[in-house]
């Protein structure tokens, strides 16, 4: 979702979304100078009227967020960026038509990794989104994403791995041998949109085995 | 203790309309994917339709959309499915379901529901 | 949609004996699939998840494993109350498919 460029003031408009938090940002082209300043503007697709971003008017910063605007992520909007440097005609560039849902990538998940003696547990927590419900509260991922999983992998040498996979948020890694290190990674799935996040990485130690010390 | 329990099957007449509900208790109703799936005589199983109870993001099997709707009144904690323009092939055992820590592992004991002149 | 192709539709099996039953996926689905036991007149009863993981208070004679785009459902020993028709299910994308049953009778 970038345009095109065919001026020296304003290029690679596009956003850039992440957990549904949707960022407006752009580049200065070659004519552009520090005295260059951007006016940020959005709206709805199938609406004729443009609406001016309070906060992102004549800035000099290159990025503009737009999360709460474009918080409905069943709809599709365009946001158009305005370059105006001294003693020159203002430049307007446009984005591609933005759709959160389809567009915004899946951050790690948030993990919780807990050793034991001969297990280590993996605790995802749920992964609060800017969008809201009817009623006025966060949404998480799992809320949006019917089709979202995690896949868990527990790396106990170069060679053997061990798998998990579920929408589940508790999940245990069993048969571990005691005192010895582990490599585990978590990941977010969601194979309709093709979504895949990159994996949550912790290196977590297993418990000592103290058993024999009350025989 | 989790339970779902399904009412409002009974026999309709092709192109006629059913509301089934399914009234929910034993967990947090207002925050879960709750299911209709259903099962003709002799027949298997088939997911008919999804609903989150919080973002109130629906899915549809392609041979209902347009005709069913489903939804939710979490005030009630109730899920429905309205059922519109029925034809002989919705005939069925029609269960609620909902997904607890992942799993779809609570299902309502069922409601008939046939279509037939 | 995803295609669950399951088999066999149906088996005899005297109590005692190991049973499989297999599902194939038209496509992958990594180890989203679930395994059901349904008795007449009764709702489905989740026996296995993520492939081979074992629903809490489901005997150990049931298991699961995957290779592949192909699961497996083995009972180790048959007993009469296992007797009832076997479902695999997709949970990987929607709309979640069934495959279409095997019916375990006795010989």
């Known amino acids: 979702h970038t345009t095109v460029d065919t001026s020296g003031l304003l290029q690679h408009v596009k956003f850039q979304s992440s957990n549904f938090e949707n960022i407006l940002t752009w580049d200065g082209g070659p004519a552009s100078t520090s005295d260059t300043v951007y006016s940020v503007e959005y709206k709805k697709y199938g609406e004729r009227k443009w609406l001016a971003k309070a906060g992102c008017q004549r800035i000099t910063q290159k990025f503009c967020n737009l999360t709460m605007e474009t918080r409905n992520h069943t709809e599709f909007y365009y946001a158009k960026v305005t370059a105006v440097s001294a003693g020159g005609p203002p430049v307007t560039k446009m984005t591609d038509r933005f759709s959160s849902l389809q567009h915004t990538t899946i951050k790690p998940p948030d993990v919780t990794c807990i050793p034991k003696v001969r297990s280590i547990q993996m605790l995802v927590h749920p992964t609060l989104t800017p969008v809201l419900s009817e009623d006025g509260h966060q949404l998480t991922l799992e809320e949006i994403f019917h089709d979202l999983f995690y896949r868990l992998e527990l790396h106990v040498n170069h060679t053997y791995q061990m798998h998990l996979e579920g929408k589940q948020r508790e999940y245990e890694f069993l048969g571990l041998t005691p005192d010895t290190e582990f490599l585990g990674s978590i990941t977010i799935l969601t194979p309709i949109l093709s979504k895949e996040s990159a994996p949550y990485v912790c290196r977590v130690k297993t418990l000592p085995d103290r058993t024999w010390a009350y025989s | 203790e989790v339970q779902l329990v399904e009412s409002g099957g009974g026999l309709v007449q092709p192109g006629g309309s059913l509301r089934l509900s399914c009234a929910a208790s034993?967990?947090?109703?207002?925050?879960?994917?709750m299911y209709w799936v259903r099962q003709a005589p002799g027949k298997g199983l088939e997911f008919v339709s999804v609903i989150n109870t919080r973002s109130g993001i629906t899915h549809y099997v392609e041979s209902v959309k347009g005709r069913f709707t489903i939804s939710t009144d979490n005030a009630k904690n109730t899920l429905f499915l309205q059922m519109n323009s029925l034809k002989s092939e919705d005939t069925a055992v029609y269960y609620c379901?909902?997904?607890?820590?992942?799993?779809?592992?609570?299902w309502g004991q069922g409601t008939q529901v046939t279509v037939s002149s | 949609d995803i295609q669950m192709t399951q088999s066999p539709s149906s088996l005899s099996a005297s109590l005692g004996d190991r049973v499989t039953i297999t599902c194939q996926a038209s496509?992958?689905?990594?180890?989203?699939l679930a395994w059901y036991q349904q008795k007449p007149g009764q709702a489905p009863n989740l026996l296995i998840y993520?492939?081979?993981r074992l629903q809490t208070g489901v005997p150990s004679r049931f298991s699961g494993s995957r290779s592949g785009t192909s699961f497996t459902l083995t009972i180790s020993g048959v007993e009469a109350e296992d007797l009832a028709t076997y479902y695999c299910l997709q949970d990987y994308s929607w709309p979640l498919t069934f495959g279409q049953g095997t019916k375990v009778e006795l010989k």
């Open positions: 379901a909902t997904r607890i820590q992942g799993l779809i592992d609570y």
């Open positions: 496509q992958s689905i990594s180890s989203m």
């Open positions: 993520g492939a081979s």
């Open positions: 034993g967990f947090t109703f207002s925050s879960s994917w």
